[in-house]
C-alpha cells in the first residue's frame, strides 16, 4: 500500500532542488574577447518546479536560498598582440553555485 | 592539477539529464472534474541545459530520448452523479517519465 502522505512529502522535498546546469564561462563572466577551455562548466543551480505550492500562491517559484562562490581552474585564451595566436594562461574563475532552494511566492492571494 | 578534458566530459554527461519535477495530476491528465490526492507527483523529466552544445548549432535543446509510462497509485475524488458528496477510490494514474535525455540541434549552421 502506498503512503499517499509520503508522496506529498516527496514532492515537497525533491521537486525544487540544486541541479546540474552547464554555464558558458564567457557569458557568465561577460569576458567577451576571451576564449575559455572548457567553454562550459557544470554548476549547481536551483531547478525543477513548484507545481503544487504549499503556500496560497498565484505564482510559486523555485529560487536559491543559499548561494556560494566556487572557484574553477580553466584555460584562458585571449588576443594579446597582432592577428595570430592567442595568449594562454591558467586562471581561476568564480561561479555561483546554489546550495539550497525554496519554493517562494511571487504574488500571494488573499484566499 | 585539474584535468580540463574531464570537465568538458562532465558537462556533456550531466548538464542535460532526467530530473525530478512535480506535475499536477489534474493538469497532466486533463481531468478537471476530479480531485486527486496527492495533487502533485514527482516524475523524471529531462532538465538542465545544453549551453555548450557539441554540435554546430544555433539552438541546442535538452530533449527526451527514452520515455516510459509509470503507474502511480493515488486517491481519486469525483462528484457522485445526481447526489451530493464525493466518490472516493484508489486509482493508478499513468505518467510519462523521461529515462534518457540528449542535446539535440534545433537549427544547425553550416559553419
Amino acid at each position: 500500500v502506498v503512503d499517499l502522505n509520503l508522496l506529498t512529502e516527496e514532492v515537497r522535498l525533491y521537486s525544487c532542488t540544486p541541479r546540474n546546469f552547464s554555464v558558458s564561462i564567457r557569458e557568465e563572466l561577460k569576458r567577451t574577447d576571451t576564449i575559455f577551455w572548457p567553454g562550459c562548466l557544470l554548476v549547481k543551480r536551483c531547478g525543477g518546479n513548484c507545481a503544487c505550492c504549499l503556500h496560497n500562491c498565484n505564482e510559486c517559484q523555485c529560487v536559491p536560498s543559499k548561494v556560494t562562490k566556487k572557484y574553477h581552474e580553466v584555460l584562458q585564451l585571449r588576443p594579446k598582440t597582432g592577428v595570430r595566436g592567442l595568449h594562454k594562461s591558467l586562471t581561476d574563475v568564480a561561479l555561483e553555485h546554489h546550495e539550497e532552494c525554496d519554493c517562494v511566492c511571487r504574488g500571494s492571494t488573499g484566499g | 592539477v585539474v584535468d580540463l578534458n574531464l570537465l568538458t566530459e562532465e558537462v556533456r554527461l550531466y548538464s542535460c539529464t532526467p530530473r525530478n519535477f512535480s506535475v499536477s495530476i489534474r493538469e497532466e491528465l486533463k481531468r478537471t472534474d476530479t480531485i486527486f490526492w496527492p495533487g502533485c507527483l514527482l516524475v523524471k523529466r529531462c532538465g538542465g541545459n545544453c549551453a555548450c552544445c557539441l554540435h554546430n548549432c544555433n539552438e541546442c535543446q535538452c530533449v527526451p530520448s527514452k520515455v516510459t509510462k509509470k503507474y502511480h497509485e493515488v486517491l481519486q475524488l469525483r462528484p457522485k452523479t445526481g447526489v451530493r458528496g464525493l466518490h472516493k477510490s484508489l486509482t493508478d494514474v499513468a505518467l510519462e517519465h523521461h529515462e534518457e535525455c540528449d542535446c539535440v540541434c534545433r537549427g544547425s549552421t553550416g559553419g
Epitope: R26, R31, T32, D33, T34, I35, L77, R78, P79, T81, G82, V83, R84, G85, L86, H87, K88 | N56, N58, T109, G110, G111
Partner: antibody, heavy 119, light 112 residues
Framework: EVQLVESGGDLVKPGGSLKLSCAAS????????MSWVRQTPDKRLEWVAT????????YYPDSVKGRFTISRDSAKNTLYLQMSSLKSEDTAMYYC????????????WGQGTTLTVSS | DVLMTQTPLSLPVSLGDQASISCRSN???????????LEWYLQKPGQSPKLLIY???NRFSGVPDRFSGSGSGTDFTLKISRVEAEDLGVYYC?????????FGGGTKLEIK
C-alpha cells in the same frame, strides 16, 4: 554554409570618409574574431584591421591607425570598417575575413567591396 | 616590418607537372608562443583568396592532398604534386607571427 558579404564600397574624394559593412551568416558570429584585408590595384594584399569576438580587442597596422576603426554588432551579425581622412593609396578591394577559433589562420573570406579614392 | 619575398613571380607549368613556390622572410617568423604562423592562399581570377595551408604545413579542410607546405625559420615552400587546371591562379604566402602581418607579392601559376 559560412558566408561573408561586404558592401558600402564607393568613389570618395581624398580626405573623405566611408563606412564598409560585412554581413556574416552560417556561423555564430559572436564567437569569432574578424578582420579586414585589402587588395590594391597592383594586386598586393595588405592587412587592415582585426577585432576580437567581443569587440574589445582591436589591432591596426600603422598605415591605417588613427584613421580607420573596426567595430562589430553581434545582434546584427555585422562587421564594420569606418574609414576617414582617406588617401589615394587606400584605393583597393576590401575583404572581410573570419579568424579561426584559436586565431591560427583566416579561414573564410568574403567576395570584397571596392573603394576608390580620387578627386 | 617582415618582408616576404616570393619566387618565382610567374610559374608556367604543364598540367600533371609538379610545381614549387618559394617564400622567404627577412627574419625568423616564429611567434613568441613557439608557433610559426605561415599561411598560403590561392586567389583565382575574379575571386577572393582561399586558404590552402596554415602554420607552415597544415592543410585546411577540403584542400586536396596534392598541396603540401614545408619549411622553417625564414625559408618556406609550397608544393603541388600534380598540377590540375583548377589550381591556376595567384599564390600568396602570409606571415602573422609579427606585427604588422605581411603578405608575399604573389606567384602566378599559369599554363605553359
Amino acid at each position: 554554409e559560412v558566408q561573408l558579404v561586404e558592401s558600402g564600397g564607393d568613389l570618395v574624394k581624398p580626405g573623405g570618409s566611408l563606412k564598409l559593412s560585412c554581413a556574416a551568416s552560417g556561423f555564430t558570429f559572436s564567437n569569432y574574431g574578424m578582420s579586414w584585408v585589402r587588395q590594391t590595384p597592383d594586386k598586393r594584399l595588405e592587412w587592415v584591421a582585426t577585432i576580437g569576438s567581443g569587440g574589445s580587442y582591436t589591432y591596426y597596422p600603422d598605415s591605417v591607425k588613427g584613421r580607420f576603426t573596426i567595430s562589430r554588432d553581434s545582434a546584427k551579425n555585422t562587421l564594420y570598417l569606418q574609414m576617414s581622412s582617406l588617401k589615394s593609396e587606400d584605393t583597393a578591394m576590401y575583404y572581410c575575413a573570419r579568424q579561426a577559433p584559436l586565431w591560427d589562420y583566416s579561414d573564410y573570406w568574403g567576395q570584397g567591396t571596392t573603394l576608390t579614392v580620387s578627386s | 616590418d617582415v618582408l616576404m619575398t616570393q619566387t618565382p613571380l610567374s610559374l608556367p607549368v604543364s598540367l600533371g607537372d609538379q610545381a614549387s613556390i618559394s617564400c622567404r622572410s627577412n627574419q625568423s617568423i616564429v611567434h613568441s608562443n613557439g608557433d610559426t604562423y605561415l599561411e598560403w592562399y590561392l586567389q583565382k581570377p575574379g575571386q577572393s583568396p582561399k586558404l590552402l595551408i596554415y602554420k607552415v604545413s597544415n592543410r585546411f579542410s577540403g584542400v586536396p592532398d596534392r598541396f603540401s607546405g614545408s619549411g622553417s625559420g625564414t625559408d618556406f615552400t609550397l608544393k603541388i604534386s600534380r598540377v590540375e587546371a583548377e589550381d591556376l591562379g595567384v599564390y600568396y604566402c602570409f606571415q602573422g607571427s609579427h606585427v604588422p602581418p605581411t603578405f608575399g607579392g604573389g606567384t602566378k601559376l599559369e599554363i605553359k
